[in-house]
Interface confidence: low
Amino acid sequence: YKAEVTVSQVYSGSLRVLNRHFSQDLGRRESIAFRSESAKAQKMLQELVASTRLGTYYNSSSVYSFGEGPLTCFFWFILDIPEYQRLTLSPEVVRELLVDELLSNSSTLASYKTEYEVDPEGLVILEASVNDIVVLNSTLGCYRYSYVNPGQVLPLKGPDQQTTSCLWHLQGPEDLMIKVRLEWTRVDCRDRVAMYDAAGPLEKRLITSVYGCSRQEPVMEVLASGSVMAVVWKKGMHSYYDPFLLSVKSVAFQDCQVNLTLEGRLDTQGFLRTPYYPSYYSPSTHCSWHLTVPSLDYGLALWFDAYALRRQKYNRLCTQGQWMIQNRRLCGFRTLQPYAERIPMVASDGVTINFTSQISLTGPGVQVYYSLYNQSDPCPGEFLCSVNGLCVPACDGIKDCPNGLDERNCVCRAMFQCQEDSTCISLPRVCDRQPDCLNGSDEEQCQEGVPCGTFTFQCEDRSCVKKPNPECDGQSDCRDGSDEQHCDCGLQGLSSRIVGGTVSSEGEWPWQASLQIRGRHICGGALIADRWVITAAHCFQEDSMASPKLWTVFLGKMRQNSRWPGEVSFKVSRLFLHPYHEEDSHDYDVALLQLDHPVVYSATVRPVCLPARSHFFEPGQHCWITGWGAQREGGPVSNTLQKVDVQLVPQDLCSEAYRYQVSPRMLCAGYRKGKKDACQGDSGGPLVCREPSGRWFLAGLVSWGLGCGRPNFFGVYTRVTRVINWIQQVLTGGGGSGGGGSHHHHHHGSHHHH
């Protein structure tokens, strides 16, 4: 005799009893009415299962909750199924067996026929697990049923000191969807919240779970697929306050079927977004957007933010949204990079874009901007990176495209190519009134507009000039004079310690900022406009440093231990972290501080010049870093502002030193032999380069490095030209405050060193 191997299969679900009605007592598990009714309903469920062929497998069951409307019973039951039948008894099959029994004319005296008028249509059976039952049982001491009426905002209070875990079973009218709002109120929190697209905590119906506070998402709203949701709130150790406000409402289903016709222009024309954006999209989301282009000269570009699409095998579900575009199946995924999906138009001038949630697990709502691009020249003067759909500078010595193709096939890399014989000359020699090419082609077209390219400067009227770095050089190169606008910057106030550095003189670096908390210098920064200071995002990594209210910014400061008449201080009214900043890779390590009042410029306080995106800082050039950081690795911060000259390093050289962890948003400076470098406390401070005009331009921000001043390891700086678009966007009020997906922070202090 061989014992048959069985497996415990757990099913969860609900049924409606048409001849019973919900009462408030039934909503409280501790009431006598609940205990009595749940025992009867459990017996009825047991009889129902037993009267089908599932009866022989029956193990146990429970009715754990009741809901509004005709009385809704929420239950689970366990069947011990022979191993070989495990796959044949899916929730759909089990439901069918139970519905058939409910509809049959059998003359049974069982309570599901005599006492309870069970609605077969309303029977819901879902797959569950033993673990789901364990989680459910752990919350039964604090189980709260709430019916959410339309128009009502229902606050949900956290577990009290006696209970560690609570479950809300939320239900609303059948034609509406449940929406939960979670708002962080504290920077320090250890509580967990999990939201399920079901009446109970079924792992397979998890919508999202949240642990720890997210500064990137101070408020999150989460949609269920329909009128039922379960929310489990588990209290963390030593958590004496609710770290967030939780509330819920019932909302109408929002349609996302759109037909649009685009105009024949190349700028952004609008956006598509999931219902209730920026709410998490619902597990039942199905959007269909049909876009028509004016002619086949154009392709359609979809611009995503912190979200990208990629091919996925057909047998794999998309876990963060499925996209169908021109019969191509793509999966969305969260990323801390920009991304564009380019849709070429070949035979038809229309395209349908479908977005579907394939699983219950969802994520922040998706917003995609759309524009047209010229199919014959998608990236005028630049390189189309087919990996991410972006236009990137070509042959500038920086691999912007993840596969590096923008730097392949270059005749002249980061140099000017003579038309006569393809020889290469360094960029500063172009339009310098000194012919270097064989026939002087480097000095031609210097007074007129040229096609835009990697190193051409774009004027405000969108025309381009050939002369490299024409900004603020005292000569008007643009027809509209825009290269000489906003030039109240970059001049040292008076004539003219960092590792290997020397002491600075007063007014020598009038843009230098000291960012302090409670009188202690934490990071450097640079003044870039009358209310704005730029610094490194990693200065704000620690949760205890995340609030702008904590910071004081000093300008015109020389010594840390004393004040002098030339220095001024400011509070910070707003803090903007780059939305793509990633602490582990140090990518996009830039932040902007808005000061509480405007700066009055003086000899000791004035801004540095910001470079254009096309500004070329030549490898080998000597530039300067300044700060109050440590003067040796592991040493204390300096009292007096230090300065040191460093050499800009070619990207490939630096990339090799750091085993290819150097992104296009990074720039390296220092020396192979080390000695001169930034160090702890210099983070966020300026790396500035002097142009021939005498003006100083911000090339980088102190970001990270291996140790300080070590041989073969350069200092790594945020490359300002690669984040300048975001800087301008924030300065002109275009937001950019750092959405960037659900992105939790655990950080390690200033000037990372490994």
């Epitope: 091919r311 691999k399 993840p402 596969n403 590096g404 392949r408 096939n409 990339s655 992104s663």
Partner: antibody, heavy 124, light 111 residues
Framework: EVQLVESGGGLVQPGRSLRLSCAAS????????IYWVRQVPGKGLEWVST????????AYADSVKGRFTISRDNAKNALYLQMNSLRTEDTALYYC?????????????????WGQGTTVTVSS | QSALTQPPSASGSPGQSVTLSCTGT?????????VSWYLQHPGKAPKLMIY???KRPSGVPDRFSGSKSANTASLTVSGLQAEDEADYYC??????????FGGGTKVTVLG
């Protein structure tokens, strides 16, 4: 199993043409740069041609430039080498090889999967 | 593009180390850190042993190590074993999407 299988080799007279094929399986073909490399019996390896995953970057060795054409059909997971104006010095075993997966910013220019090769003999 | 220079042969006894050299120019081996090494047994396809000068693909024993100095790359096989007897080829990226191979070194395991 990751595999590359070459075919189309044979005996051909100088000046004539031949088309080699390489069938890929077991990996996402259109994620990879692919190479043709040849080897004269008893001699060393010689790089012949490279094609990027979307065919927008193609390169040839000086010895075959203007005579050979590399192409790929990602829908069919296939790589081709059209060889025209064949010369006796083109006699060799022709391999197709896949470039090793690149890390985030760099290609490796290293071939981690090779076929078994197909023999081309150019003789009158 | 001219081939990289490799010595035609090298040998060593089991357990010993053998170092193979691969000399190029300042525009291939000297400029790029994209040197690879391949092993080829008679009648078989080449097998990648080292890429990016010194990185080993998974499955390659740590007896194989690579390095580079100026225009010369080296492959060291330590603790020589009978199955290491084979032809070894180096290759380097040479710019403009071109790859250049060495002429190969025949390694003999003595005894």
């Amino acid at each position: 199993e990751v595999q590359l299988v070459e075919s189309g080799g044979g005996l051909v007279q100088p000046g004539r043409s031949l088309r080699l094929s390489c069938a890929a399986s077991g990996f996402t073909f259109n994620d990879h740069v692919i190479y043709w490399v040849r080897q004269v019996p008893g001699k060393g390896l010689e790089w012949v041609s490279t094609i990027s995953w979307n065919s927008d970057t193609i390169a040839y060795a000086d010895s075959v430039k203007g005579r050979f054409t590399i192409s790929r059909d990602n829908a069919k997971n296939a790589l081709y080498l059209q060889m025209n104006s064949l010369r006796t010095e083109d006699t060799a075993l022709y391999y197709c090889a896949r470039e090793k997966d690149g890390d985030f910013y760099y290609d490796y220019f290293a071939m981690d999967v090779w076929g078994q090769g197909t023999t081309v003999t150019v003789s009158s | 593009q001219s081939a990289l220079t490799q010595p035609p042969s090298a040998s060593g006894s089991p357990g010993q180390s053998v170092t193979l050299s691969c000399t190029g120019t300042s525009s291939d081996v000297g400029y790029y850190n994209y040197v690879s090494w391949y092993l080829q047994h008679p009648g078989k396809a080449p097998k990648l042993m080292i890429y990016e000068v010194s990185k080993r693909p998974s499955g390659v024993p740590d007896r194989f190590s690579g390095s580079k100095s100026a225009n010369t790359a080296s492959l060291t096989v330590s603790g020589l074993q009978a199955e290491d007897e084979a032809d070894y080829y180096c290759s380097s990226y040479a710019g403009s999407n071109k790859v250049v191979f060495g002429g190969g070194t025949k390694v003999t395991v003595l005894g």
